[in-house]
Amino acid sequence: MACPLEKALDVMVSTFHKYSGKEGDKFKLNKSELKELLTRELPSFLGKRTDEAAFQKLMSNLDSNRDNEVDFQEYCVFLSCIAMMCNEFFEGFPDKQPRKK
Amino acid sequence: MACPLEKALDVMVSTFHKYSGKEGDKFKLNKSELKELLTRELPSFLGKRTDEAAFQKLMSNLDSNRDNEVDFQEYCVFLSCIAMMCNEFFEGFPDKQPRKK
């Protein structure tokens, strides 16, 4: 069976394509596809920020090549940012740190 | 229960700390910690490349701030690169693409 980290990477890839394949360019997320991905797959990250301006800002921040879509590389940068936020939270609670084995 | 993508991000974080906490700076991976992480958690990526020179080269490539350790941000860049390699493989097989619902 795949190791948890390999499985995690597979989930990153398959989740992207689950939504990118719905409309237009099947290898990119447009705004509505990104919105659906966030709402369904990252509800903890999204929280209550469901207003249109918040989505537009997020889309703009992710879209580094300014083509009004989020490609896989831009999506990876986004997930890395979320992971880094999670990591900062994790590092803030030393009692939750894994101990030496 | 956490969505698969949220779980994947959690695995990314927890896997890093599972190894970074073993020696020295508990928030960074030194060479031996990185080697152990790769061997145990990413065996498919690693394949047969277990020679010292390959590890040195990989360590050097990941260590963008040149402190001889891999911090969480550098680790995220690394995982993103692997994810992008997986994605290229995935995109190369259009029959595996999710269809419109």
């Epitope: 237009g24 800002k57 703009s60 921040n61 580094s64 090549n65 300014r66 083509d67 009004n68 | -």
Partner: antibody, heavy 120, light 107 residues
């Protein structure tokens, strides 16, 4: 109300470097926007030069890329443009603009523009 | 680069007239089309973005339509302050490109 103001020398000698700064007021210089330079040659159309935005991400017009450099100073609410090896063809009115985060990323606020003449 | 072609390059009209300006892109720009107004010696002002969305403070006599490669800016009833030059701009991809402009003059 957002205001943008271009500043810099109005006359630059050929082969030298054109340097312009745009000061943003009335709004925080946030990551939510991209900050652009656009020029208009005398009596002609508009040409997008480049922009700087989220996380310091920079995109340049490929036709000018080799001569361009853009930067920003968030503490001063400023961003700047450097265009090297200028010729008479670089004579234009230079505008700084804010690029909105809405669909199509329109330029929603513009400076008044500053005329830069390249001449010896 | 995406080429943007505007027509006509100039037109004469009277106050109260309905004015139509067209813009054609060299490829599909997926409605990412913005319109600007420039008065002599002045800065540009955003009128419409994403084909038909009115920027805040812009009068409702301005409207936009189109899809694919062909787009239109319409001024339903020309006012004295509308005599200016109008530019279309694609926001679909980099580098951003503009149309050559349409000068609206008093007849």
């Amino acid at each position: 109300q957002v205001q943008l103001q271009e500043s810099g020398p109005g006359l630059v000698k050929p082969s030298q470097t054109l340097s312009l700064t745009c000061t943003v007021s009335g709004d925080s210089f946030t990551n939510d926007y991209y900050w652009n330079w656009i020029r208009q040659h005398p009596g002609k159309g508009l040409e997008w030069i480049g922009h700087i935005g989220y996380g310091g991400n920079i995109n340049y017009n490929p036709s000018l890329k080799n001569r361009l450099s853009m930067s920003r100073d968030t503490s001063k609410n400023q961003f700047s443009l450097k265009l090297s090896s200028v010729t008479a063809a670089d004579t234009a009115v230079y505008y700084c603009t804010r690029e909105s985060f809405y669909d199509g990323y329109p330029f929603d606020y513009w400076g008044q523009g500053t005329l830069v003449t390249v001449s010896s | 680069d995406i080429q943007m072609t505007q027509s006509p390059s100039s037109l004469s009209a009277s106050v109260g007239d309905r004015v139509t300006i067209t813009c054609r892109a060299s490829q599909d720009i997926r409605n990412y089309l913005n319109w600007y107004q420039q008065k002599p010696g002045g800065a540009l002002k955003l009128l419409l973005y994403y084909t038909s969305r009115l920027h805040s403070g812009v009068p409702s006599r301005f409207s936009g339509s189109g899809s694919g490669t062909d787009y239109t800016l319409t001024i339903s009833s020309l006012q004295p302050e509308d005599f200016a030059t109008y530019y279309c701009q694609q926001g679909n991809s980099l580098p951003r490109t503009f149309g050559g402009g349409t000068k609206v003059e008093i007849k």
